[in-house]
Amino acid sequence: MAPWPELGDAQPNPDKYLEGAAGQQPTAPDKSKETNKTDNTEAPVTKIELLPSYSTATLIDEPTEVDDPWNLPTLQDSGIKWSERDTKGKILCFFQGIGRLILLLGFLYFFVCSLDILSSAFQLVGGKMAGQFFSNSSIMSNPLLGLVIGVLVTVLVQSSSTSTSIVVSMVSSSLLTVRAAIPIIMGANIGTSITNTIVALMQVGDRSEFRRAFAGATVHDFFNWLSVLVLLPVEVATHYLEIITQLIVESFHFKNGEDAPDLLKVITKPFTKLIVQLDKKVISQIAMNDEKAKNKSLVKIWCKTFTNKTQINVTVPSTANCTSPSLCWTDGIQNWTMKNVTYKENIAKCQHIFVNFHLPDLAVGTILLILSLLVLCGCLIMIVKILGSVLKGQVATVIKKTINTDFPFPFAWLTGYLAILVGAGMTFIVQSSSVFTSALTPLIGIGVITIERAYPLTLGSNIGTTTTAILAALASPGNALRSSLQIALCHFFFNISGILLWYPIPFTRLPIRMAKGLGNISAKYRWFAVFYLIIFFFLIPLTVFGLSLAGWRVLVGVGVPVVFIIILVLCLRLLQSRCPRVLPKKLQNWNFLPLWMRSLKPWDAVVSKFTGCFQMRCCCCCRVCCRACCLLCDCPKCCRCSKCCEDLEEAQEGQDVPVKAPETFDNITISREAQGEVPASDSKTECTAL
């Protein structure tokens, strides 16, 4: 593992920009620079080694001023001003605006629907496996195992509410204690943040857009990971979440409430239920060791059923096994007893695509996974395109200023807390933190929202999803009310604790710095984004899961040296950047390590070799495949969607030449125009939103 990518011989200097050095990034964009900046700001030619080569297109130019890659781009208005238009032009422009709004809402609708179907697809592919994770008896004694199970299950079912409801049903049926459930809830919090990270991957086409989008998405990941890193040991030591929530649950005499309002589902369900409908109870039944459930399909076939309670006669090994001594007999051959059963009569089939196909869950899941990712990607690209054409000039300035500007002094500090409330409110409305944060991601990418503003919105989203859970808990039946409410409150207080740790003091806003660092790395080495996703959401949890199954000794034996090395590297990194003089000369930089341990460059070469075959066939028949291709091969031409990567070799040869700053080609339309790919006249017909 590289202690920090691309550190080379660089001496710590806070004034200079170092690729990947999150610690040296300004935490907020310089507002004074922001207003006048255009997309043609150029990077300096001096000290080339400190410049990140962020643009895939090698455009030789003479840079004039240093540019912060985290400053929001000015989306220039290339259209005719409103005042200069005639009546016909104004009417045309008005209808264009209405059309764009309808298209935007339409794509947004299908974007949310595809997220719902993506969740269903994941449940079909990995739901049963997720259920089996829960049936592991070691969860009770090992909080770390509980944590990774929470992560893995939520990643597999793409829904924290599903994994939380499984936990609730297990607690209410005494298969799990609240104490054992808390780490699982923490893990579910981490797992749910994978969705917007996947969404961010869809914006891989433009480096600077991808940098912002990926950082904006992973700020959620880092907040959750850091919160767990601090709060899980605190919880294990003090059980503060368990105690606080128990006191709350016991002090209030809750009446069963109404069901939590399904606000967004009301709109999306009519469409998504035509695609697929799932029987979510199956995963819960598997988690509760129901053997019959393992052979059941998650795909719901019958939507209208009649349930009739009746007594049936069942054979038992001997009369000692009778359910009731008075209801026991033999027919001379077998021993019988009466059992109360609920007989389900199927009346009407569900109305969805897969109802009559009788395909295995894995097949249905795979089909839906591919289709939902394609729709998700397509919608996202279209949303970004429409927003890109709408949010230009004055409109962009107004929106960006509204969203990103703080309250006047002395109330500036309140802005973030208002953003937290807005995030919580919006998540409560859409009933899903995944949907809210996923919708936020492209906005961060195109530069409408800063990461500094996205951070409190994301934190608010974390709170919003727990308030939904609390409402759902209050609507639970009597036997599940206590446990579900306590778990929902644990989730709530865990997020509150996390916010108190990583938000109030600007210095403690580590998730922003870490996300920006990861954004920088991923912008340069785009494969690293996928690598990060696999490592943090699959490999690390699976490794911990495997080691936990092997026992405490193995877990400690492997874990302690790994943790020790990480702490050592972090301490050394901190000393190198803050006070290098206290260190021996050899330890003042990472040069004492082999290149593959301190830089991603050698790894990049390996990845490039593997993806070389893709590079030569980097065909851009459509934007979607083009994006996937860009992610794999870092191809300079495919992201502009030209025919193929013919000039690949020349592009690779010219990689060490100074390049234009990343913000230069933020807006796709402008970048194409600047390169002569789009005739100038094309953009003149663009209509600025009113």
Epitope: L327, T330, G332, N335
Partner: antibody
Amino acid sequence: QVQLVQSGAEVKKPGSSVKVSCKTSGFFFTEYIIHWVRQAPGQGLEWIGGIIPNNDVTNYKQNFRGRVTLTADKSTSTAYMELSSLRSEDTAVYYCARWRNAYYSAMDSWGQGTTVTVSS
Amino acid sequence: DIQMTQSPSSLSTSVGDRVTITCTASQDVGTAVAWYQQKPGKSPKLLIYWASTRHTGVPERFSGSGSGTDFTLTISSLQPEDVATYFCQQYRTSPLTFGGGTKVEIK
């Protein structure tokens, strides 16, 4: 209507075997258990054993095990009881009776009985 | 094996009289008891099953009661055609066992 028609009376020598048949009609043979009960002259009823024709699962009273064999022919809806190593105390009227499988209604229909006499 | 003891072994009474036959099981059999009627020279006929449920076609004058170890067959008003031997049978555990029988006669 429901009928269980048994084979005619038999006179056997000690040590020999006897095979009594019970032909059924008027009901689904495979949905019932066929039991065999005997009654020695002037005595009570004694259960011998039973067979589930559907899967040929049998059970016998301990003192008849090894001597009695119950079989069923689904094609003709007929049940058979073969008793070997006959002794004089095996002289009795042998009845077949049906019992609805998986139900607690007991032996609701009986055959007319087959008299087996064992004498030298 | 569970022993079923019937009493009396025989009884003689007048037409229209109430007749009560008891059956005692050597251990708890719940309600898994059946009563059969066997007329001279005929095969047995099911009267009562599950201790108190009348079989189809059985006259209402026949009723059964009891649970556990003590069971009763009652003929509320004895009719001439009721002359027969009555057997109780337990079907709680295998092997199935019958009572010794109660012979009912009319004076």
